[in-house]
Interface confidence: medium
């Protein structure tokens, strides 16, 4: 048995409500992107900004599919492409193994009801490995930088939260019971958990780079929309079979 | 629901033109290939014509190249078939069909998953 | 005459299980292009019944399974009931014709 993609009809759960009839959801993609030869990379696209349904995502590069993932059908990947694409994580791809004739560029095509089609483009630029390398040098100091800032920032956040929580909490003890349930159910499908084979019913990790372009409140909508997908996607959503 | 509702088949002469309509509801038209399929009476299925999504791409039956012209206009949420120069060998009923995806290369992987209810064309003096 | 070839006819008896064949070549169904099987019951339209080679929609029932292997595909039917006598078509598309094909059809009867 094979389960919906809960994440495709989640995508719009968290959007407000906004004029129908005209096209206002935007693609955020991991835009320019470079990997090493024979490394693997996840392609990821998001969708927001829009109430519509999503019904299906493809994959394609220049003019070749790659991968579909359809809300009652489920993942398909391209038989040319299966040895070295995996679905996910969430609507985006795994490539692997990658070679240099994999630089160029990739699409994700979001199919919606009623807006229709929108497309992310991002450019992938294989790297021969010692040049890939080269460019690591220069990347690592950053990202331990960014990573530092982060884990300082996070602390400080979490020590605020803490207290403050720690306060509320000598005063509502129900509440806390309550919260303490709704965490117990987010566990059972947080963005790390497995879905079930072949599904594409996982949570969508925020693609790379998403967070520092974005305002903070919307990162914190991202955040908040994978808490609700987290336990709501404990509901029935089996609408697929498949044969083997 | 997804639904599709073909109209304009009816009794036309040989040599005459007849335009079918196939008007789309419940789904992102704009989203999807679509094909016309016939079936003539006691025969089986016959492909004749698909468009890509967007229109850019159409594609015929041989037996139909030439004479038949598939059109969309998304705007509408309709597909039409354009029928010209019409024989005998025409009569059946027509199909419209979706096909499981869009997108913008992949139409001929994915078969069609809907089908309207039909309309029927006949083509005799 | 049609580019996939099927039986004309088959027919089973209530909980048997009937196979129906369907052979093409090298630029359809030996391709990598998928074979999709619709059911075309009496007097309606066709319905899709099996995509992607091998797999169901939803709502359609576990006794219906499919397969391919080289340039031939064949739908099996297995405790076969008397609903499900109809006919059967395997449909690809065919990169020599740039066309979509389908099989002549095949009437399942149900005795």
């Known amino acids: 048995m094979r389960w919906c993609l809960l994440l495709i009809w989640a995508q719009g759960l968290r959007q407000a409500p906004l004029a129908s009839g005209m096209m206002t959801g935007t693609i955020e993609t991991t835009g320019n992107i470079s990997a090493e030869k024979g490394g693997s990379i996840i392609l990821q696209c998001h969708l927001s900004s829009t109430t519509a349904q999503v019904t299906q995502v493809n994959w394609e590069q220049q003019d070749q599919l790659l991968a579909i993932c359809n809300a009652d059908l489920g993942w398909h990947i391209s038989p040319s492409f299966k040895d070295r694409v995996a679905p996910g994580p969430g609507l985006g791809l795994t490539l692997q193994s990658l070679t240099v004739n994999d630089t160029g560029e990739y699409f994700c095509i979001y199919h919606t009801y009623p807006d229709g089609t929108y497309t992310g483009r991002i450019f992938l630029e294989v790297l021969e490995s010692s040049v890939a390398e080269h460019g690591a040098r220069f990347q690592i100091p950053l990202l331990g930088a960014m990573a530092a800032t982060l884990v300082v920032i996070c602390t400080a956040v979490i020590v605020v939260v803490a207290l403050t929580r720690k306060k509320k909490a000598l005063r509502i003890h129900s509440v806390e019971g309550d919260l303490r349930r709704k965490s117990a159910g987010q566990e059972e499908w947080s963005p790390s958990a497995p879905s079930p084979p072949g599904s594409c019913v996982q949570a969508e990790a925020a693609p790379a780079g998403l967070c520092g372009e974005q305002r903070g409140e919307d990162c914190a909508e991202l955040h908040d929309y994978f808490n609700v997908l987290s336990y709501r996607s404990l509901g029935n959503c089996s609408f697929f079979t498949e044969t083997g | 629901e997804v639904q599709l509702l073909e109209s304009g088949g009816g009794l036309v002469q040989p040599g005459g033109s007849l335009r079918l309509s196939c008007a789309a509801s419940?789904?992102?038209?704009?989203?999807?290939?679509m094909s016309w399929v016939r079936q003539a009476p006691g025969k089986g299925l016959e492909w004749v014509a698909g468009?890509?999504?967007?229109?850019?791409?159409?594609y015929y039956a041989d037996s139909v190249k030439g004479r038949l012209t598939i059109s969309r206009d998304n705007s509408k949420n309709t597909l039409y078939l354009q029928m010209n120069n019409l024989r005998a060998e025409d009569t059946a009923i027509y199909y419209c069909a979706k096909h499981l995806t869009g997108g913008t290369t992949d139409y001929y992987y994915y078969g069609m998953d809907v089908w309207g209810q039909g309309t029927t064309v006949t083509v005799s003096s | 005459q049609s580019v996939l070839t099927q039986p004309p006819s088959a027919s089973g008896t209530p909980g048997q299980r009937v196979t129906i064949s369907c052979s093409g070549s090298?630029?359809?169904?030996?391709?990598?292009?998928?074979v999709h099987w619709y059911q075309q019951l009496p007097g309606t339209a066709p319905k899709l019944l099996i995509y992607f080679d091998s797999q169901r929609p939803s709502g359609v029932p576990d006794r219906f399974s499919a397969s391919k292997s080289g340039t031939s595909a064949s739908l099996a039917i297995s405790g076969l009931q008397s609903e499900d006598e109809a006919d059967y078509y395997c449909?690809?598309?065919?990169?020599?014709?740039?066309?979509?094909?389908f099989g002549g059809g095949t009437k399942l009867t149900v005795l």
């Open positions: 449909a690809t598309w065919d990169d020599s014709l740039s066309a979509w094909v």
């Open positions: 090298t630029s359809n169904i030996g391709t990598s292009r998928y």
């Open positions: 419940g789904f992102t038209f704009t989203s999807y290939a």
């Open positions: 468009i890509s999504y967007i229109g850019r791409n159409e």
